[in-house]
Amino acid sequence: MAVTACQGLGFVVSLIGIAGIIAATCMDQWSTQDLYNNPVTAVFNYQGLWRSCVRESSGFTECRGYFTLLGLPAMLQAVRALMIVGIVLGAIGLLVSIFALKCIRIGSMEDSAKANMTLTSGIMFIVSGLCAIAGVSVFANMLVTNFWMSTANMYTGMGGMVQTVQTRYTFGAALFVGWVAGGLTLIGGVMMCIACRGLAPEETNYKAVSYHASGHSVAYKPGGFKASTGFGSNTKNKKIYDGGARTEDEVQSYPSKHDYV
């Protein structure tokens, strides 16, 4: 039951995280105009990964896409790539994890196969979360660098003619959404990996075999002391005889080519 809960929670947390990563990637507020020097501006600038916008106090907002690839800073391209990779990995991870969920039955899929899929999706979520966190952090670092550069040189000449105050940009809402979303995806991935350990059969239990020694009639069970006392790794004390109705957690696993433990 705990395994199912951990896996389900990991899936939900990752789903929220990936939705957040997608939202952050699409948002226009990656960087917003710093209003420290001019808190009463009638024109507010903000920028995203795909376009830059200007909101006038009249209510009119104008956005312009970055209709160039070669003219964009390499760092921005890198951030775009990281976010897209994060989304793609996360989406694949979600797809895999849906089939891996213990509460969903697909044919006669074995626990070991589900464990493999859970681990795969968990790793994908972790990498996806790391990509998002890395992307957002790279952008934030770029902002901090530019912020202090423009602070050091607040007044810059435009073509040597007009003196204009340089617009400084600070962290936008998308950065915080990205960090939180990346963190959630990462946590969801870790939870999936933890759930995978619980799904995987930790020990192979065989059907009871009777050995007939001369003069004695004693039945020996493989596993010796562990199997009969409930100590060791087999804490669930699974039934090792064949027959009777079983609960989901009691279903016996048999060795297969998918086993990796």
């Epitope: 009638a42 024109v43 106090s57 009249s58």
Partner: antibody
């Protein structure tokens, strides 16, 4: 058609109060920022105050700050300017205008209401 | 606060001649984000309310005759009436719409010589 109609002007003694109203029609009032601009007799235009569409941002000219209060009632499509501690130099025609256009430009103006501060 | 200095105070021009009004700002009105200058020009005819002529320093409002031209960037702006008509007799104001308070210039009175 966009219409802005000011009312509430009149003669008031120095130190007195007056409340101007601006009734808007012909556009989605709740979506646009609104301004008050005044013009003293024979003088130029002087911007007085601005209120954003949702009243989140309100700005005043230094000459009226602390004395004038700007508000709006979006369901009633009405803009208000509460003027307290009036001085002789506040005598002017008061126009309400809207930044309905691009570039923060004041596109639509009312006909104005006259405020006279005199003893 | 942004201070706008208009010159000349008044201008007398013959019909069909060019009228040029200058507006200088104490601060740049250029916005890097959209590469636009936040300066507006208004016309106020005698006994009438002001009307918008030009926004973004050089964009004519629809319906405004093309003899009115706005130019300039940063701190120096100009309104040009290429061929003055009788109906152009008015006071012209420039306005900073970049930062609050949205200050106006003192105005330039255009008359016929």
């Amino acid at each position: 058609d966009v219409q802005l109609v000011e009312s509430g002007g009149g003669l008031v003694q120095p130190g007195g109060s007056l409340r101007l109203s601006c009734a808007a029609s012909g556009f989605t009032f709740s979506s646009f920022g609104m301004h008050w601009v005044r013009q003293a007799p024979g003088k130029g235009l002087e911007w007085v105050a601005y209120i954003s569409s949702g009243s989140g941002s309100i700005y005043y000219a230094d000459t009226v700050k602390g004395r004038f209060t700007l508000s709006r009632d979006n369901p009633k499509n009405t803009l208000y300017l509460q003027m307290n501690s009036l001085r002789a130099e506040d005598t002017a025609v008061y126009y309400c205008a809207t930044s309905y256009y691009y570039g923060n430009a004041l596109e639509y103006w009312g006909q104005g209401t006259t405020v006279t501060v005199s003893s | 606060d942004v201070v706008l200095t208009q010159s000349p105070d008044s201008l007398a021009v013959s019909l069909g001649e060019r009228a040029t009004i200058s507006c200088k700002s104490s601060q740049s009105l250029f916005n890097v984000g959209n590469q636009k200058n936040y300066l507006t020009w208004y016309q106020q005819k005698p006994g009438q309310t002001p009307t918008l002529l030009i926004y973004w320093a050089s964009t004519r409002k629809s319906g405004v005759p093309d003899r009115f031209t706005g130019s300039g960037s940063g701190t120096d702006f100009t309104l040009t009436i290429s061929s003055l008509q009788a109906e152009d007799v008015a006071v012209y104001y420039c306005q900073n719409v970049y930062s609050y308070p949205l200050t106006f210039g003192a105005g330039t009175k255009v008359e016929i010589k």
